[in-house]
């Protein structure tokens, strides 16, 4: 079998004139492409891998949101020679860019990386970026992740930065076919220059505060209960409560009203992400949909 | 939740123009991102014009370009596509479509909820 071959990490990597043509191994008897786009409010990019696949034949799309990241992801397997180039890559996945100007900035500021390589996108260097409200989302929290694309034995992968709805989500991630977007969120202006060690300690977890020993009393009607004022006694380490499989927690902070209507529940997905997927759990959604292959 | 619903499909000659509309009931029209999408018999649902809660992002098929154009009435709570210079191949089941982002979304899979869509005919 002989198969297109690239990969694209926010440039023209696989246009017509830098794709290769790779014969396969031996028993490999699908050609795959693979197209991830990543959107904040602040724009968009894409990855694209091409090359020899693994698995059956058939298509999968499935869109993601996590904390107002969108994320769209394309795998396509397919058996005959080179007929891995069918996906536009460079056509717009997810929305246009609006007029930014419209919108009034929130106060927030966060560095923005939205197709920019890992040199470019460290510490303080990446550009700044005013975060504004879109609809009744508000956008105060500022991101610093990753997405990874993995097809035909390839693993790509670019940081991600920007505006996100939650100011305190850590080392939180969706994933699709062969595909991964993850990191942390922060609370205040440019807080996103490295979130990589960022642990679980967050003002929604309440303190643990430690209580007087009761003193011994002979009248227990006259004793007035005083509890401590001293300083809260944080606990050493934390551990991430992981979300039910079965069941999807509900976002906390910012909610969009629409969103607490009776819904089908999804099943899976980390807390406070939507995993938009066409794989008939909203039949409703999109039209008729064809079926999974399990080759993707 | 919000209930859609189409109207203005019909039956017209080639080069003439249809006013399709939506009306929204429910909660917040206003703070959703909508949609035109359309389904020819055979072919996937492929987006048509999308616009943002405000209004202010408007994405447009490269197919209708010049030729439709999307607005809403947020006061209103509908959605307009106002189509010209129909062809032939803008035939289908138009749909009206919502999704919580806000945004001018260009992928189905982003949108939460759906009408039940309107025919347009384009034939002489």
């Known amino acids: 079998l002989e198969c297109y071959s690239c990969v694209q990490k926010a440039d023209d990597g696989c246009s017509p004139n830098k794709m290769k043509t790779v014969k396969c191994a031996p028993g490999v008897d699908v050609c795959t492409e693979a197209v991830g786009a990543v959107e904040t409010i602040h724009g968009q990019f894409s990855l694209a891998v091409r090359g020899c696949g693994s698995g059956l034949p058939g298509k999968n799309d499935r869109g993601l949101d996590l904390h107002g990241l969108l994320a769209f992801i394309q795998l396509q397997q397919c058996a005959q020679d080179r007929c891995n180039a069918k996906l536009n890559l460079t056509s717009r996945a997810l929305d246009p860019a609006g007029n930014e100007s419209a919108y009034p900035p929130n106060g927030v500021e966060c560095y923005s990386c939205v197709g920019l390589s890992r040199e470019a996108c460290q510490g303080t260097s990446p550009p700044v970026v005013s975060c504004y409200n879109a609809s009744d989302h508000v956008y105060k929290g500022c991101f610093d992740g990753n997405v990874t694309l993995t097809a035909a034995n390839v693993t790509v992968s670019l940081p991600v930065r920007g505006c996100v709805q939650d100011e305190f989500c850590t080392r939180d991630g969706v994933t699709g076919p062969g595909f991964t977007l993850s990191g942390s969120c922060c609370q205040g202006s440019r807080c996103n220059s490295d979130l990589r060690n960022k642990t679980y300690f967050s003002p929604r977890i309440p303190p643990l505060v430690r209580l007087p020993p009761p003193e011994p009393t002979t009248v227990a009607s006259t004793t007035s209960v005083t509890t401590s004022t001293s300083a809260p006694v944080r606990p050493t380490s934390t551990t991430k409560p992981m979300p039910a499989p079965t069941s999807q927690t509900p976002r906390q902070g910012v909610e969009h009203e629409a969103s607490r209507d009776e819904e089908p529940r999804l099943t899976g997905g980390a807390a406070g992400h939507q995993d938009r997927s066409n794989s008939g759990q909203y039949p409703a959604k999109g039209g008729p949909q064809q079926p999974h292959n399990k080759g993707c | 939740q919000v209930q859609l619903v189409e109207s203005g499909g019909g039956l017209v000659q080639p080069g003439g123009s249809l006013r399709l509309s939506c009306a929204a009931s429910g909660r917040s029209f206003s703070s959703y991102g909508m949609g035109w999408f359309r389904q020819a018999p055979g072919k996937e649902r492929e987006i048509v014009a999308a616009?943002?809660?405000?209004?202010?992002?408007?994405y447009y098929a490269n197919s209708v370009k010049g030729r439709f154009t999307i607005s809403r009435d947020n006061s209103k709570n509908t959605l307009y596509l106002q189509m010209n210079s129909l062809r032939a191949e803008d035939t289908a089941v138009y749909y009206c479509?919502?999704?919580?982002?806000?945004?001018?979304?260009?992928?189905?899979?982003?949108?939460?909820?759906w009408g039940q869509g309107t025919l347009v005919t384009v034939s002489s």
């Open positions: 479509a919502a999704n919580r982002q806000g945004r001018a979304l260009v992928r189905k899979e982003f949108y939460d909820y």
């Open positions: 616009i943002s809660w405000g209004g202010s992002a408007v």
